[in-house]
């Protein structure tokens, strides 16, 4: 004869377990049902009556089989630097990712806390290490012999023209004027782009040019506290 | 203990003026890349400005260019946050950061040193 199907709630055997998707009540001592995603359980199971589950209210989820009393609140909405990569259902919580230009400066367990724009090389200074979706560009002065002129977060310092006779030296912020009509260059003319996983910052957050400062020696800090808890008002 | 303060928040009338300061302690400020965030309320934090201190070059949101203004007094190990001609929508809670600047193998680049914050508010 077939096994005898127990429908919940129901008494597991000594030392055995409950269903798949099916959670064990300590208080009724028997083995009762989940809720499915997008609901909660509203009223607990019993001896003798299973889970009662309820659908999340507008701005808050449950994204796996559960018997949670309250539907998880879903984060804040995004800010203006981020993108709405999934947005907030009773399934699943909103995810905010980084709009071009800019990288994630501050993460959460999905998407981002905070985008900060990408940094952008003023002239006399090139991208020693370009930006990722979690790194900022690192800038350095440009080297005797290369220059950059650009306000980029993708050019490198690039050499000199090399010059038969040399009208105007160069200098970090200015390639060496020729007054040879045919100079030679080490490499291809033009702004030099380091491959770059985000595209460049957008304009409005071009630097304001202040005096330059000799870098100073970098000091490593252990991470501190966390910033204010993320609000979950929702929307 | 590497901490920063923030402080000077406070219920200021449309068109008023505050100044934030944040002040580094346990770690020197010299070396590092300064920025504020704000949260608003309900909404996410939104980077507002930043100040990279091998250059000392600043950059600004775009809500609050001409109006805010960030700077450092390295003597005083603080960074400040000039507010001007505030709106409502620059109500929220305002923090500071700091980080190294581009990070290193040891400690990749993220916001290292994170503040409290302190709470603005922008009514009539």
């Known amino acids: 004869l077939p096994a005898q199907v127990a429908f919940t709630p129901y008494a597991p055997e000594p030392g055995g377990t409950c269903r798949l998707r099916e959670y064990y009540d300590q208080t009724a001592q028997m083995c009762c049902s989940k809720c499915p995603p997008g609901q909660h359980a509203k009223v607990f199971c019993t001896k003798t009556s299973d889970t009662v589950c309820d659908s999340c209210e507008d701005s808050t989820y449950t994204q796996l089989w559960n018997w949670v009393p309250e539907c998880l609140s879903c984060g804040s909405r995004c800010s203006s630097d981020q993108v709405e990569t999934q947005a907030c259902t009773r399934e699943q919580n909103r995810i905010c990712t980084c709009r071009p230009g800019w990288y994630c400066a501050l993460t959460k367990q999905e998407g981002c806390r905070l985008c900060a724009p990408l940094r952008k090389c003023r002239p006399g200074f090139g991208v020693a290490r370009p930006g990722t979706e979690t790194s900022d560009v690192v800038c350095k002065p440009c080297a005797p012999g290369t220059f950059s002129n650009t306000t980029s977060s993708t050019d490198i310092c690039r050499p000199h023209q090399i010059c038969n006779v040399v009208a105007v030296p160069g200098n970090a912020s200015m390639d060496a004027v020729c007054t040879s009509t045919s100079p030679t260059r080490s490499m291809a003319p033009g702004p030099v782009h380091l491959p770059q996983p985000v595209s460049t910052r957008s304009q409005h957050t071009q630097p304001t040019p202040a005096p330059s400062t000799a870098p100073g020696t970098s000091f490593l800090l252990p991470v501190g506290p966390s910033p204010p808890a993320e609000g979950s008002t929702g929307d | 203990d590497v901490q920063l303060v923030e402080s000077g928040g406070g219920l200021v009338h449309p068109g008023g003026s505050l100044r934030l300061s944040c002040a580094a302690s346990g770690f020197t400020f010299s070396a590092d890349d300064a920025t504020w965030a704000r949260q608003p309320p309900g909404k996410g934090l939104e980077w507002i400005s930043t100040l990279y201190f091998d250059t000392e070059e600043k950059t600004y949101a775009d809500s609050v260019k001409g109006r805010f203004i960030i700077s450092r007094d390295i003597a005083k190990n603080t960074v400040y946050l000039q507010m001007n001609n505030l709106k409502p929508e620059d109500t929220g809670m305002y923090v500071c950061?700091?980080?190294?600047?581009?990070?290193?193998?040891?400690?990749?680049?993220?916001?290292?040193?994170w503040g409290q914050g302190t709470q603005v508010t922008v009514s009539s």
């Open positions: 950061t700091a980080t190294w600047a581009g990070g290193s193998l040891l400690r990749p680049a993220s916001f290292g040193v």
